[in-house]
């Protein structure tokens, strides 16, 4: 059974996750040249499912196409370069779905935008945040 | 009403040079990238590249790089195509079009240049 | 140079289905976009990021997309629909490009 230090942990490296996402979300949407509106010409694969800590296996393989587009934003509205913005989102994945655990990501039929892809991890890292509360 | 309105038909020699216009209303216009696209008779769509009037950041299609200039004042809402030689070839029918959602959603009704030689 | 491949020409009767494809390499990871062009017209879009309807687009008209391949399906074909259609993408580079168009004959 989970310890609270582990719980503790856990909330912690998704509270992480989360400001990290959200850090892309705003560097995006306060786009003046919306250069935003070429970034959305990017498709996102979706999760069938999003329930567990083992689905970020899901967001993983997604990170280095999200890589790709985030440099199109010349990085000027984020804090760290690309490379090291999912670097740092890279570790807390692992961490969080464990690297020992093989589990095979289901994909959803439907494609998303680089804003509906990041909203929907956004709200998964919400939605595990207070159940651990 | 949203839309574009382009400058109309122009008939010119080969060697001539030439600015076609294309202004924009109902909406923000400096917020918008605006995009050209040629058609030449009987043929299909080429995308020849693309603005954004704020600043009058360009992107270029490789195969229209050097053969033709996008500008833009935002003052009054217009962007321009302009070449500064014009050939044969280039006879075609050029759309400006609206870049909103990724997708080119409002189109100008076309200016159609002849180029005789 | 990135391309969109498409087929020269489709032909159905009124009432059938059409199906018109596009194929390129980037299209697993870029949305595509579909436009309808009338004889002596400007071009409309009619499916924006793959499947994706703007208002006033018949319901008749839907996109799907399958790894390299999308494709834009009309239903209930209808004798307006005859036209020319193309699909547009962005290569890697973010450089846009068209298909060359496939020419709907409405029999």
């Known amino acids: 059974a989970p310890t609270s230090s582990s719980t503790k942990k856990t909330q912690l490296q998704l509270e992480h996750l989360l400001l990290d996402l959200q850090m892309i979300l705003n560097g995006i949407n306060n786009y003046k040249n919306p250069k935003l509106t070429r970034m959305l010409t990017f498709k996102f694969y979706m999760p069938k499912k999003a329930t567990e800590l083992k689905h970020l296996q899901c967001l993983e393989e997604e990170l280095k196409p999200l890589e790709e587009v985030l440099n199109l934003a010349q990085s000027k509205n984020f804090h760290l370069r690309p490379r090291d913005l999912i670097s740092n989102i890279n570790v807390i994945v692992l961490e969080l779905k464990g690297s020992e655990t093989t589990f095979m990501c289901e994909y959803a039929d439907e494609t998303a935008t680089i804003v509906e892809f990041l909203n929907r991890w956004i709200t998964f890292c919400q939605s595990i945040i207070s159940t651990l509360t | 009403e949203v839309q574009l309105v382009q400058s109309g038909t122009e008939v010119k020699k080969a060697g001539d040079s030439l600015k076609i216009s294309c202004k924009g209303s109902?909406?923000?216009?400096?917020?918008?990238?605006i995009g050209w696209v040629r058609q030449m008779p009987g043929r299909g769509l080429e995308w020849m590249g693309t603005?954004?009037?704020?600043?009058?950041?360009?992107r270029y299609s490789p195969s229209f790089q050097g053969q033709v200039t996008m500008s833009a004042d935002k003052s009054i809402s217009t962007a321009y195509l302009q070449w500064g030689s014009l050939r044969a070839s280039d006879t075609a029918m050029y759309y400006c079009a609206r870049f909103s959602s990724s997708a080119y959603d409002i189109w100008g009704q076309g200016t159609m240049v002849t180029v005789s030689s | 140079s990135y391309e969109l491949t498409q087929p020269p020409s489709v032909s159905v009767s009124p009432g059938q289905t059409a199906r018109i494809t596009c194929s390129g390499d980037?299209?697993?990871?870029?949305?595509a976009y579909w436009y309808q062009q009338k004889s002596g017209q400007a071009p409309v879009l009619v499916i924006y990021q793959d499947t994706k309807r703007p208002s006033g687009i018949p319901e008749r008209f839907s996109g799907s997309s399958s790894g390299t391949t999308v494709t834009l399906t009309i239903s209930d074909v209808q004798a307006e629909d005859d036209a020319d259609y193309y699909c547009?993408?962005?290569?890697?580079?973010?450089?846009?490009?068209f298909g060359a168009g496939t020419k709907l004959t409405v029999l």
């Open positions: 547009q993408s962005a290569d890697r580079s973010d450089s846009y490009v």
């Open positions: 603005i954004y009037p704020a600043d009058s950041d360009t």
């Open positions: 109902g909406y923000n216009f400096d917020t918008y990238w």
């Open positions: 980037a299209l697993p990871r870029k949305f």
